[in-house]
Amino acid sequence: NWVNVISDLKKIEDLIQSMHIDATLYTESDVHPSCKVTAMKCFLLELQVISLESGDASIHDTVENLIILANNSLSSNGNVTESGCKECEELEEKNIKEFLQSFVHIVQMFINTS
């Protein structure tokens, strides 16, 4: 359920507020609907960077749970093959605040277009 993914993103934003994590993360800020699965996989990969950089058990657990929920939701859509989409490394690097904002936006796209 994508709303549960949103809920975990809110938890992560709450948890990182008191931390100073200056990592930059590959961020897709203008997702074409035909590349949303590819973009989501990039977001999930980059999310693990936040988990590692924070060194915080609560963030680690929430990230782990979010990835499971998102992958379950993606697999329920069936095996979607997308072509012509950007590789993760081709995306713009942004700070954590902007990354999470764009992450919420893409999850909302999955909800809105389902």
Epitope: S29, V31, Q101, T113
Partner: antibody, heavy 119, light 108 residues
């Protein structure tokens, strides 16, 4: 600076169709944002009507879904609202608004246009 | 009925602090945003996300969230803060946007 401007008839007859257009300037309707219509009956609160993404995806308030159509015209940088089978209860100020990126919000609003349903 | 509940009215003495709340189970998943609306005018976004202010919004406005409640706090209320305040978020499905019923703030 993004600006939104609603236009359309200020008076609609009962059982008729309310039609409004929102012209977007200072930004592109083909941005990553979703675009919404919100209304406010006189002396009452705000009610979300529905939203559209420039690829044509739409979502509507369940209580209005059977009567609402929102469409987008990328060539004119505008989006439109049609509300059918109107009654006096649909009399309201109608606003168009741009949704922010990420968490729910409306970061830009039109000035609003009053639509009265009366014979 | 709205999925977001606000007290219909609140008041604050000039220069004092007031907190306006918004309740709803959907706020466990989503942050709320807050709008100020003065008579005859369109709403203005004052707080969005965790606690973000759009440019031009005074820093006396702040937002917070705990459990199923979102709060808008005005620290050192001014006469020009007298207005209706609305919260906004998404519903349980995540597909639909919803507003609270609004709180009319009077500055005494």
């Amino acid at each position: 600076q993004v600006q939104l401007q609603e236009s359309g008839p200020g008076l609609v007859k009962p059982s008729g169709t309310l039609s409004l257009t929102c012209a977007v300037s200072g930004g592109s309707i083909s941005s990553s944002n979703w675009w919404s219509w919100v209304r406010q009956p006189p002396g009452k609160g705000l009610e979300w009507i529905g939203e559209i993404y420039h690829y044509g995806y739409t979502n509507y308030n369940p209580s209005l879904k059977s009567r609402v159509t929102i469409s987008v015209d990328k060539s004119k940088n505008q989006f439109s609202l049609k509300l059918s089978s109107v009654t006096a209860a649909d009399t309201a100020v109608y606003y168009c608004a741009r949704e922010g990126i990420g968490w729910p919000s409306f970061d830009y609003w039109g000035q609003g246009t009053l639509v009265t349903v009366s014979s | 009925s709205s999925e977001l509940t606000q007290d219909p009215a609140a008041s604050v003495a000039l220069g004092q602090t007031v907190r306006i709340t918004c309740q709803g189970d959907t706020l466990r998943s989503y942050y709320a945003s807050w709008y100020q609306q003065k008579p005859g005018q369109a709403p203005i976004l004052v707080i969005y996300g965790k606690n973000n202010r759009p440019s031009g919004i005074p820093d006396r406005f702040s937002g917070s969230s705990s459990g199923n409640t979102a709060s808008l706090t005005i620290t050192g209320a001014q006469a020009e803060d007298e207005a209706d305040y609305y919260c906004n978020s998404r519903d349980f499905s995540g597909k639909n946007l919803v507003f609270g019923g609004g709180t009319k703030l009077t500055v005494l």
